[in-house]
Every structure is written in structure tokens, then in C-alpha cells.
Amino acid sequence: KFSKQSWGLENEALIVRCPRQGKPSYTVDWYYSQTNKSIPTQERNRVFASGQLLKFLPAAVADSGIYTCIVRSPTFNRTGYANVTIYKKQSDCNVPDYLMYSTVSGSEKNSKIYCPTIDLYNWTAPLEWFKNCQALQGSRYRAHKSFLVIDNVMTEDAGDYTCKFIHNENGANYSVTATRSFTVKDEQGFSLFPVIGAPAQNEIKEVEIGKNANLTCSACFGKGTQFLAAVLWQLNGTKITDFGEPRIQQEEGQNQSFSNGLACLDMVLRIADVKEEDLLLQYDCLALNLHGLRRHTVRLSRKNPIDHHSHHHHHH
């Protein structure tokens, strides 16, 4: 759990973070696990500790091993372990599996490849990107911040992508490379921040006391199969099941897929025998997926019995 695998290439910079959650104000001590010898904090050393980070500038094959970090807060000491392996540089172009970071998938609509671990380093744009050891050239490839964007992705774009950047430490530059596989998904699906079609934000729904009322929460989440998407109702910020009012229940509506391919979900809130106190509640339609959560709030108001006359024209 609190042990993390890290790897790098000899003569490149490697920075490892202690796998314990902590605050910047916490003291972190680093040790060689085998010898219990403390790792220095002076930056003149090739291997030194800097708070949550352990820096190898540059790394050597002999640095491989397990390192212990102890995060000291005012209330606790927490221990973590960094399992570091430094490999010799390959003479050929092939990147072995043990040097690969997690595979990412892309599609025509979404083709970002993030450079792994880059957030730990002090680097400046632009990144250099390579595919199967060839430098990427052409207008289809755009290095943007810490990721590569590929326009009009095709199945031939699948392969191993390497990012290369320079880490700067006190005026000295060190090279870093990281490689991950990119696969291309066939389906043309995509996922968006949820869009709530109904109800409108801050909608006032008219209801009659003693009658039943239905509220529909309807939202769309993108195109094609969605990995995670949900719509639900909350009462005063509380889940319906936890609110404990048996008159008020939610029921899953249709899983819709419109002609334009949009994947949408409905959740119907059924209020039986509307009571006066129901008018005081805040009804929230929530739509959430991996992009985030959107909320539309509805209030109930009493339907005026003479409302059905209000659309008639009055003659003077």
C-alpha cells in the first residue's frame, strides 16, 4: 500500500515522491532501507532528499533498492517505501516492458498522451516526443504543456510514445525520458461534462397540495457507451434513501440514446400526496460522470386553483 515502484535510466534524472499523503509543512526523513543510513538533504549530493521528494541527479544502476521515507506530522509518524530500479540504457530502439508506464487509449475526438511523472520535475516547454524512437514531425502532432495532442487519430497512430524533457536543478540540466503505449479505440464515442436537459436551473414547479407530482431529472453525458454516468435526486442536499420520507421516491427512467447518438439518463422523482412542508424543500437534480458533477435546483410552489383561467383573454 505505502510502497511505490519507481524506475529510471542511468545518467538521467529520477525524482521519486514518498507514497504517504502529507502536507508541505510536515518533515520528511529519507533512509536507505537496508542500512538505515540517512539520506542527506544537501543539494551538492548526487542523491539527496528534498521534503517529500527523493532526487537522483543523475541516477546510477547502483542506486537500485528500497528507500524508506518517514513523514512526521505533529501528531503521527507515517512510513512509506520507494522501490527504485535504475536500468542501463538500451543500445537498440526497443523499450522493454519494465520501462513502460501505463497504457493510454485515444479516439478521434480525444487523443491526449500525457508525459508520465513530469509533474515531479522542474522542466520548461516544449517537450520532445518520439514514436518508436522517431522524432514526431508534422502538423498533426502538437506538444502542448505536459501532453501530446494527435489530430485526426488513425489506428496506425498506436505505438510506443516517448517524451523527453530537461530537468533543471540549481542551474544544472538533466535529461529525463518516459515511455508509454498508446492504443486507438475504434468506437467514435466520447464523454462530456454532464448536460442537464431538465429541469432548468432554479425552475419553479407548480404542484397541487394533496395530489401526486413527478419531477424528471434528465441529463446527457456524451456519445456511445459511458464508463460512469449517473443521475439522481437530492432533498436538501441529502440522498433520497437517507432522507427517510416514504412518500418521496426516485425511479430510474429510460436509458436513452438519441438519433444523434447522445447517451442520456432519466431519473423521475415521485412525490405522493404533496404536503405543505414539501414546498419548503430544495430539490436538486444531480448529473455526474468522470468529468464532474452538475446540479440543477428546483423549488415547488403551490398551484393557484384559478390558474387555469389565466390564459384566457379578458375583454374590456
Partner: antibody, heavy 117, light 106 residues
């Protein structure tokens, strides 16, 4: 010795909001996390949420999401927990506790909140 | 969500007894389990954190063990002041307390 002193007991009507304070002494509130825990009469402990007072980051348990707000005033080393839309089942003792991200080490004496019409 | 099942809910024992309280999770959480003791009308007190680390000032008759999904708190020889309610707490994902174990004098 670290001490956490909470505000006094409260009686509230359903639908109202309660705000409890927790003053920390012999300890800089910015240096750790502040947690809040609910305990209904005769029941177990329920974690409500935590704040990193140094930057104001909060995380809340799903059960209390949307109704609870945890804040901290680093100038007075005081944390606050506000619970809104009170219902009778919110009648409980509320504890503040300081600790790191993972657990609580020092606790306040507790504040009894009674929700009754 | 991580579910915690603490057992037993009630436990009757005598001074000098060895008692064990168990906390089982529905998913592997390694050693992010902590144990608290609470006496009536008092705030909880941390006994053991991270599975087996005794908090300073806590008597050595208290010990914690286990990893993965099953954790235990053991009191090797019960003392009169140990009769209280004990809670486990997981902090692998947010924080969740077990339901509690009330330890009573037989």
C-alpha cells in the same frame, strides 16, 4: 499539552443551522488536519469530514455532503463545523479532533446538539 | 465504499482475561486501520494506529495485528479501566468507523 475546547451545547429547531467552534491551544492549527465526528445518543462514531486549515481544502463523508461546511480561522487557531437543514436525527454529540490525513489524535470534549420542535 | 464489520458487538469478560476484537473490511486496505477506546461521556482516545503502532502512553497490554482485510485488537490481560467501547477506523478511502464493541465486566 494539546487541548481542543469546543463551544457549548445547542438546542435547534428542525430546518435550522448550527455552527460549532473548536479552539486549539498549544498547537498551530495550520500544521495538521482538523476532523469532525458525529455520535448520536447510544450510537457509534461517524466521520463527517476534514479540513487542511493551511489551504482550506475540505473533504466530506457522502452522508453529510451538501449539508456540512467545515472552515478554519488560522489567526485564532479555531475550526468550525456548520450543519444545515437540521433534522431530529442530527441530535448528537459532535467532536472536533486534530490529526493527520489518516486519523485523529487529539479530541475536543464534544458539543451536544439537540434538534427538537 | 469500504465496509467495516466489527465483531463482536458486545463482549463480557473478567479482569485478567485476554480479549480479541476483530475488524474485517470488504477490500484489501493493508495497514490503514486504527483503534480507539471510548468511555461513557468522554471523547474517544487513540490506542493503536496503522494496524500495530502503539500510541505513546498506551499500556503495552494493548496490541494490534493483521493486514489486508482482517485486523485485530488484543488486550492481553484486562484491567478494570479497560471496560469501555472500542472502535476500529479505516482511512484507506475517506474515513469509516466500525460499529463498535462494548466490553463489559462479566
Amino acid at each position: 499539552e494539546v487541548q481542543l475546547v469546543q463551544s457549548g451545547a445547542e438546542v435547534k429547531k428542525p430546518g435550522a443551522t448550527v455552527k460549532i467552534s473548536c479552539k486549539v491551544s498549544a498547537f498551530n492549527i495550520k500544521d495538521d488536519y482538523m476532523h469532525w465526528v458525529q455520535q448520536a445518543p447510544g450510537k457509534g462514531l461517524e466521520w463527517m469530514g476534514r479540513i487542511d486549515p493551511a489551504i482550506g481544502n475540505t473533504e466530506y463523508a457522502e452522508k453529510f455532503q451538501g449539508r456540512v461546511t467545515i472552515t478554519a480561522d488560522t489567526s485564532t487557531d479555531t475550526a468550525y463545523m456548520e450543519l444545515s437543514s437540521l433534522r431530529s436525527e442530527d441530535t448528537a454529540v459532535y467532536y472536533c479532533a486534530t490529526g493527520d490525513f489518516y486519523a485523529m489524535a487529539y479530541w475536543g470534549q464534544g458539543t451536544l446538539v439537540t434538534v427538537s420542535s | 465504499d469500504i465496509q467495516l464489520t466489527q465483531s463482536p458487538s458486545f463482549l463480557s469478560a473478567s479482569v485478567g482475561d485476554r480479549v480479541t476484537i476483530t475488524c474485517i473490511t470488504n477490500t484489501d486496505i493493508d495497514d490503514v486501520i486504527h483503534w480507539y477506546q471510548q468511555k461513557p461521556g468522554k471523547a474517544p482516545k487513540l490506542l493503536i494506529y496503522e494496524g500495530n503502532t502503539l500510541r505513546p502512553g498506551v499500556p503495552s497490554r494493548f496490541s494490534g495485528s493483521g493486514s489486508g482485510t482482517e485486523f485485530t485488537l488484543t488486550i492481553s490481560s484486562l484491567q478494570p479501566e479497560d471496560f469501555a467501547t472500542y472502535y476500529c477506523l479505516q482511512s484507506d478511502n475517506m474515513l469509516t468507523f466500525g460499529q463498535g464493541t462494548k466490553l463489559e465486566i462479566k
